[in-house]
């Protein structure tokens, strides 16, 4: 058993049918010695008396808010949460496996640049009685500071019969140099509590591996005289690291017909313009990627050919 | 260490091309190592990220773009020097950069070259003959060093009398390739910045 926060305790249980559970001793936070009784949650049934209460915690029915009283007055509370260990592996019931980029990915994180700011998000089908708390650091043995905000509900989607809820959090490394070569990964730890169930999820990454630039901005077309060709031009996104000559991007320009089946023409360039043939009803899209370190491509910025 | 001698070059910043080749070569080699050594811990998540140049060179600090010198987090161990010669720089463009930066890059390359050659010698003794260093990568390191044109003491290749532990050597190869790839990215960024300056 360990303390999650004041008066909230997590009991770690080896979770299998008929498991013996864990013996837990609760102590009433009071100078009083006599006439103390204990109850669980809203029940008025007296579970025991005395300054300490010894319980065998086996299932969720044994978890909850234990309260010690004296003469109708509440003295203190202890909330017991359960953390299930199923065959040596901590349970992951609360969050959905996003399966990207690999199986068992519960937290996904992205950064728009090398400033040390990043966003993480996760999915759940649970809509109520759910709280999250996020901590982060650079490295784990001698951790350096990363400050995270509060997790907020950022999106709701309908997936088949289920509703899916997306939560996200923004974090900022306290003293980040965009040009630094990372040798210690960023660690992100999310505590999730659903009713009386506690779970924790972690992710470890280098900022360089989670870079995803914003799409190029000011995408424009300039028709070339007496030709079906157009000059496409664009600019680096505002959120990208500067100077751009040091933090360079490379670009992919795509001409896509109305039908998804039509052949796509693609051009790769390090410049911020390209000459392409504009077909009728086609659209031109441009996306960006770090020129020197192949992390994710940005989303497409698009303009119609007409 | 001798300071570099500037050789006027009216054309494009000549080291940019070499540094791009370097990044391509080390990325290819790392990919090959990951595939060939699939049963070894060779991914970015599995290896310890060691930097053999730590405390010996200061490439990131010495080559910091002027725009980032205002960022206190980038200035922890910054040694500033505005001596600006080096054959990669056309003489009229030298005012933006430090010789320290280019000499630091040169020292990095030299250290990695020695490590890679020592390691290759060990890998050649492996009866499994599982993986060797790409000669193209070694050649590209050499070409960039020549383009940088620093005269510096040759570091003798480390020789080891004891029987090599091939498992450890292969893991060390992965660690070295990951670190060198990250340094090659920095070098490429620096060359691109200098080319634009």
């Amino acid at each position: 058993i360990w303390e999650l926060k004041k008066d909230v305790y997590v009991v770690e249980l080896d979770w299998y049918p008929d498991a013996p559970g864990e013996m837990v001793v609760l102590t009433c936070d009071t100078p009083e010695e006599d006439g103390i009784t204990w109850t669980l949650d809203q029940s008025s049934e007296v579970l025991g008396s005395g300054k300490t209460l010894t319980i065998q915690v086996k299932e969720f029915g044994d978890a909850g808010q234990y309260t010690c009283h004296k003469g109708g007055e509440v003295l203190s509370h202890s909330l017991l949460l359960l953390h299930k260990k199923e065959d040596g592996i901590w349970s992951t019931d609360i969050l959905k496996d996003q399966k990207e980029p690999k199986n068992k990915t519960f937290l996904r994180c992205e950064a728009k640049n090398y400033s040390g700011r990043f966003t993480c998000w996760w999915l759940t089908t649970i809509s109520t009685d759910l709280t999250f708390s996020v901590k982060s650091s650079r490295g784990s043995s001698d951790p350096q500071g990363v400050t995270c905000g509060a997790a907020t509900l950022s999106a709701e989607r309908v997936r088949g019969d289920n509703k899916e809820y997306e939560y996200s959090v923004e974090c900022q490394e306290d003293s980040a140099c965009p040009a630094a070569e990372e040798s210690l990964p960023i660690e992100v730890m999310v505590d999730a509590v659903h009713k009386l169930k506690y779970e924790n999820y972690t992710s470890s990454f280098f900022i360089r591996d989670i870079i995803k630039p914003d799409p190029p901005k000011n995408l424009q077309l300039k028709p070339l005289k007496n030709s079906r060709q157009v000059e496409v031009s664009w600019e680096y996104p505002d959120t990208w690291s500067t100077p751009h000559s040091y933090f360079s991007l490379t670009f992919c320009v795509q001409v896509q017909g109305k039908s998804k089946r039509e052949k796509k023409d693609r051009v790769f360039t390090d410049k911020t313009s390209a000459t392409v043939i504009c077909r009728k009803n086609a659209s031109i899209s441009v996306r960006a990627q770090d020129r020197y370190y192949s992390s994710s491509w940005s989303e497409w910025a698009s303009v119609p050919c007409s | 260490r001798n300071l570099p001698v500037a050789t006027p070059d009216p054309g494009m910043f000549p080291c940019l091309h070499h540094s791009q080749n370097l990044l391509r070569a080390v990325s290819n080699m790392l990919q090959k190592a990951r595939q060939t050594l699939e049963f070894y811990p060779c991914t970015s998540e599995e290896i310890d990220h060691e930097d053999i140049t730590k405390d010996k060179t200061s490439t990131v600090e010495a080559c910091l773009p002027l725009e980032l010198t205002k960022n206190e987090s980038c200035l922890n161990s910054r040694e500033t020097s505005f001596i600006t010669n080096g054959s990669c720089l056309a003489s009229r463009k030298t005012s933006f950069m430090m010789a320290l930066c280019l000499s630091s890059i040169y020292e990095d390359l030299k250290m990695y070259q020695v490590e890679f050659k020592t390691m290759n010698a060990k890998l050649l003794m492996d009866p499994k003959r599982q993986i060797f260093l790409d000669q193209n990568m070694l050649a590209v390191i050499d070409e960039l060093m020549q383009a940088l044109n620093f005269n510096s003491e040759t570091v003798p290749q480390k020789s080891s009398l004891e029987e090599p532990d091939f498992y450890k050597t292969k893991i060390k190869l992965c660690i070295l390739l990951h670190a060198f790839r990250i340094r090659a990215v920095t070098i490429d960024r620096v060359m691109s910045y200098l080319n634009a300056s």
Epitope: D14, W15, I89 | -
Partner: antibody, heavy 115, light 112 residues
Framework: QVQLVQSGGGVVQPGRSLRLSCAAS????????MHWVRQAPGKGLEWVAF????????YYADSVKGRFTISRDNSKNTLYLQMKSLRAEDTAVYYC????????WGQGTMVTVSS | SYVLTQPPSVSGTPGQRVTISCSGG????????VKWYQQLPGTAPKLLIY???QRPSGVPDRFSGSKSGTSASLAITGVQAEDEADYYC????????????FGTGTKVTVLG
């Protein structure tokens, strides 16, 4: 004590369907994940499928994906395996099993796929 | 499709020490704990070892398990005639959990 009693096995022709049941008692069935494992005659153990305690997530071996469906009825304390498009290579003893460091197995039920 | 490799058979005379190996990889045994099962003919598997080296109550102490790196082993110290059975190791793969990964199985024969 914990008990898992299986039923539903038998002889079936290729291409046909069969449903296996596993009735649980002696524990809070709705709190635990459950597996199906099979063993072809003279062969080793092969995992077939898993279902979470609340039925929210199901996982399948590639060899049965799209043909077999694992389900549970927590109100009846019963686990099911619906098997469709059966093949000769599905012939095996099928076991249900609780998920956890200490596990309990059903007695097994034989499924024979033969024409 | 078995990723955990065991020797097909091992044998020993009563009182001898018999060991069975189970070889896997970084993503399974290297990252997760190992269980061992005993299966007597015509019966369901019985748990002998969980968590690499833990014995459930009721399992004789002549059975012991260990794990090192990407391999695990089961030792029967002072093998007895009633130990003649098939033995399976089991673990998980970190990418496909909760799918169970079983070893190929080992037939233990007690001679004489």
């Amino acid at each position: 004590q914990v008990q898992l009693v299986q039923s539903g096995g038998g002889v079936v022709q290729p291409g046909r369907s069969l449903r296996l049941s596993c009735a649980a008692s002696g524990f809070t069935f709705s709190s635990y994940g459950m597996h199906w494992v099979r063993q072809a005659p003279g062969k080793g153990l092969e995992w077939v499928a898993f279902i979470r305690y609340d039925g929210s997530n199901k996982y399948y071996a590639d060899s049965v994906k799209g043909r077999f469906t694992i389900s549970r009825d927590n109100s009846k304390n019963t686990l099911y395996l619906q098997m469709k498009s059966l093949r000769a290579e599905d012939t095996a003893v099928y076991y249900c099993k609780t998920h956890g460091s200490h596990d309990n197995w059903g007695q097994g039920t034989m499924v024979t796929v033969s024409s | 499709s078995y990723v955990l490799t065991q020797p097909p058979s091992v044998s020993g005379t009563p009182g001898q020490r018999v060991t069975i190996s189970c070889s896997g990889g970084r993503s399974n045994i290297g990252s997760n704990s190992v269980k061992w099962y005993q299966q007597l003919p015509g019966t369901a598997p019985k748990l002998l070892i969980y968590g690499n080296d833990q014995r459930p109550s009721g399992v004789p102490d002549r059975f012991s398990g260990s794990k090192s790196g990407t391999s695990a082993s089961l030792a029967i110290t002072g093998v007895q005639a009633e130990d003649e059975a098939d033995y399976y190791c089991q673990s998980y793969d970190r990418g496909t959990h909760p799918a169970l990964l079983f070893g190929t199985g080992t037939k233990v024969t007690v001679l004489g």
